[in-house]
Amino acid sequence: AVNGTSRFTCFYNSRANISCVWSQDGALQDTSCQVHAWPDRRRWNQTCELLPVSQASWACNLILGTPDSQKLTAVDIVTLRVMCREGVRWRMMAIQDFKPFENLRLMAPISLQVVHVETHRCNISWKISQASHYFERHLEFEARTLSPGHTWEEAPLMTLKQKQEWICLETLTPDTQYEFQVRVKPLQGEFTTWSPWSQPLAFRTKPAALGKD
């Protein structure tokens, strides 16, 4: 038997993916475990194999369909179970009635690009990925810029309280290398959380013009 504290957390990306993490103190590393998804209103079910991500936690992605298909709505409730093999039997380790639109985490923004760069400012754009059309403008973003000699954790957060897929960074230092990241969150959902940060976009500001003698 597996003892210890269990934690089972899942998020819906608003389209066709439910990502789950199961952590269990004292769990056996070599145990084969799966997440089973049974929607209450739909005649499909889905399974994914939990793979270790750390000493006592496992993760997997339930792929419900093609990336941009709308597989669930706010009416759906999905029963999610962690099932682990014990000999020839499967044992249920965790269960939750999952409300997809109360537990949202979108995919990280993609296609970051520098639209225009100057000595002290840089205009950057991005796109959201695999987000339900349901949200329309009801999204917010956070962005951060990595300056030389600092860490991402030290970077101040810039908040965009609307669906705005661009930003103009000001007061930058000329001829300096920066990196930029952005993340997105829907306004809906009691347990909704921020998407992962986007892949960093590296850019360099233009050098200051040389003064005349």
Epitope: D40, R42, A74
Partner: antibody, heavy 120, light 106 residues
Framework: EVQLVESGGGLVQPGGSLRLSCAAS????????MSWVRQAPGKGLEWIGE????????NYAPSLKDRFTISRDNAKNSLYLQMNSLRAEDTAVYYC?????????????WGQGTTVTVSS | DIQMTQSPSSLSASVGDRVTITCSAS?????MHWYQQKPGKAPKRWIY???KLASGVPSRFSGSGSGTEFTLTISSLQPEDFATYYC?????????FGGGTKVEIK
């Protein structure tokens, strides 16, 4: 061919009760959510409630849940609507409807309806 | 509950006319569905998931929209299209219907 046939309608006095039935055929009834929807004379459609395949989940329109009860018998391929404490405003054609989905959820088949008249 | 408002409630049009029916939801919905109903008959699923035509529905029908505003369009009205059309959402419980749009012959 999917068929839904309602029965049990008729004239009933205010305060009375009536039990409507919906006989399903042409599909695996035990796998589908089902709903009751009504339509008052000359009016629009009003959802009454729904029941899931194994009867473990039954939801009602808030205004009707105290007087109406939905049930089903998968062995008989039948859906039921028990209506109590009937009022004049319950006069309507009552339809049973099957749920289906592609991405969103909708009603894909409807019965022909059964008429309930509440009058003294 | 999400309230659905259809406009117009009725319209008179001639065969060959282009007809547009609008459905406004009081809150955002993921999809809108449309049903056709003829007098004395049960409703029929007509358009689902906002823009997909049910089996047997002629291609002169189309559906569009997102958020809170949705439309059903008939590009060239035919005699068999005279009926009442209802919109319906099921993005949250309870499912709700619009009040209907009656398409009559001018």
């Amino acid at each position: 061919e999917v068929q839904l046939v309602e029965s049990g309608g008729g004239l009933v006095q205010p305060g009375g009760s009536l039990r409507l039935s919906c006989a399903a055929s042409g599909f695996d009834f035990s796998r589908y959510w089902m709903s009751w929807v009504r339509q008052a004379p000359g009016k629009g459609l009003e959802w009454i409630g729904e029941i899931n395949p194994d009867s473990s989940t039954i939801n009602y329109a808030p205004s009707l849940k105290d007087r109406f009860t939905i049930s089903r018998d998968n062995a008989k391929n039948s859906l039921y609507l028990q209506m109590n404490s009937l009022r004049a405003e319950d006069t309507a054609v009552y339809y049973c409807a099957r749920h289906d989905y592609d991405e969103g959820i909708y009603f894909d088949y409807w019965g022909q309806g059964t008429t309930v008249t509440v009058s003294s | 509950d999400i309230q659905m408002t259809q406009s117009p409630s009725s319209l008179s049009a001639s065969v060959g006319d282009r007809v547009t029916i609008t459905c406004s939801a009081s809150s955002r919905v993921i999809y809108m569905h449309w049903y056709q109903q003829k007098p004395g008959k049960a409703p029929k699923r007509w358009i689902y998931d906002t823009s997909k035509l049910a089996s047997g529905v002629p291609s002169r029908f189309s559906g569009s929209g997102s958020g809170t505003e949705f439309t059903l369009t008939i590009s060239s009205l035919q005699p068999e299209d005279f009926a009442t059309y209802y919109c319906q959402q099921w993005s949250s419980n309870p499912p709700t219907f619009g009040g209907g749009t009656k398409v009559e012959i001018k």
